[in-house]
Amino acid sequence: ESGYAQNGDLEDAELDDYSFSCYSQLEVNGSQHSLTCAFEDPDVNITNLEFEICGALVEVKCLNFRKLQEIYFIETKKFLLIGKSNICVKVGEKSLTCKKIDLTTIVKPEAPFDLSVVYREGANDFVVTFNTSHLQKKYVKVLMHDVAYRQEKDENKWTHVNLSSTKLTLLQRKLQPAAMYEIKVRSIPDHYFKGFWSEWSPSYYFRTPEINNSSGEMDPI
């Protein structure tokens, strides 16, 4: 539980930039939470570097991270989930740099899954649905979702729709006829907890029907 490195200590090590970032995932494995940290500089020599978290823990002073290639990882039930923890990069007993972080403000939800799109011919629309593991969780239950879709040929022209439910209706007339679309979704905490966007769900691809010449409407696929 040593503090910051003293001046003159570990002189070579202190020439490096040990900036790091972390994210937490709550109830990621049953009732277990996880905390993942990584250096912002991918070229940092991590050979002798360790991460340690102290404070805001249940009945322990500190926990050590496991090293998994270039990331550092903890899975535990021992987060109090209130107040700030002290997360330090260490060489042996010496701390090179530390950050005070409230784990409830760096939550990264799990990626949504089971994304699908169903065309409703009578309604002339597409119903987008997806699932999230957070519906079953005790803590991070309220999420904002970002649904992004694009015509496959338009590499960077994504249209984004924010929603709090797991169902979205896209009107057929807003989409190009006879076109292939890619759609994906991600999530971010939206109540009490704060943090980062999840990873994107796997993309789903769907084709819009052609326009029916006589009526000006799209043909079903």
Partner: antibody
Framework: QVQLVQSGAEVKKPGASVKVSCKAS????????MNWVRQAPGQGLEWMGL????????SYNQKFKGRVTLTRDTSISTAYMELSRLRSDDTAVYYC????????????WGQGTTVTVSS | EIVLTQSPATLSLSPGERATLSCSAS?????MHWYQQKPGQAPRPWIY???KLASGVPARFSGSGSGTDYTLTISSLEPEDFAVYYC????????FGGGTKVEIK
């Protein structure tokens, strides 16, 4: 203003249990830990445990684990400390204290509840 | 578990004198806090995170230290400063020192 108001003094027999309440006002109850600290007559301070009122997660001093139970009722912003199997050396003033989560010090204290254990 | 030893147990000084209270930890502590307690009253936060003065604490108080040795200093004692002062580690199990009583000589 921020305030913690504790229940009144108690006299208990050895082997009995005591439950002390701590009513919080003037702040968001679920935003800070509630800690319990005791002080035997003429002695120093001893941390017993804490509760996170948001989720009910508790952390106990190993010395008291199994004898102390911390609970809360968020609807009335009140925390409770129950100590069981009382002994004469549990005679003390029991304080609730709000935990500042940025620095982990106890920034607001209740007035204290005197618990006397005597046969 | 870390043990915090405060010295001296009692400090007998006159108003206007300088007071130096020590808190020694059995192993390294990142942050230390200090509380003031007067007879019949609850403790009051006095100095937190080594050197930050709690609300309403006069500037004649200061805190310093690192590792295992921490100090609370009162530059010039005022009558209201005579009390018991406790140090406390910031982390589980939030151990307190035994206290230093600052009394009027």
């Amino acid at each position: 203003q921020v305030q913690l108001v504790q229940s009144g003094a108690e006299v208990k027999k050895p082997g009995a249990s005591v439950k002390v309440s701590c009513k919080a006002s003037g702040y968001t109850f679920t935003g800070y830990t509630m800690n319990w600290v005791r002080q035997a007559p003429g002695q120093g301070l001893e941390w017993m445990g804490l509760i996170n009122p948001y989720n009910g997660v508790t952390s106990y001093n190993q010395k008291f684990k199994g004898r102390v139970t911390l609970t809360r009722d968020t609807s009335i912003s009140t925390a409770y400390m129950e100590l069981s199997r009382l002994r004469s050396d549990d005679t003390a003033v029991y304080y609730c204290a709000r935990g500042d989560g940025n620095y982990w010090y106890f920034d607001v204290w209740g007035q204290g509840t005197t618990v006397t254990v005597s046969s | 578990e870390i043990v915090l030893t405060q010295s001296p147990a009692t400090l007998s000084l006159s108003p206007g004198e300088r007071a130096t209270l020590s808190c020694s930890a059995s192993s390294s502590v990142t942050y230390m806090h200090w509380y003031q307690q007067k007879p019949g009253q609850a403790p009051r936060p006095w100095i937190y995170e080594i050197s930050k003065l709690a609300s309403g604490v006069p500037a004649r108080f200061s805190g310093s230290g690192s590792g295992t040795d921490y100090t609370l200093t009162i530059s010039s004692l005022e009558p209201e400063d005579f009390a018991v002062y406790y140090c406390q580690e910031w982390n589980y199990p939030y151990t307190f020192g035994g206290g230093t009583k600052v009394e009027i000589k």
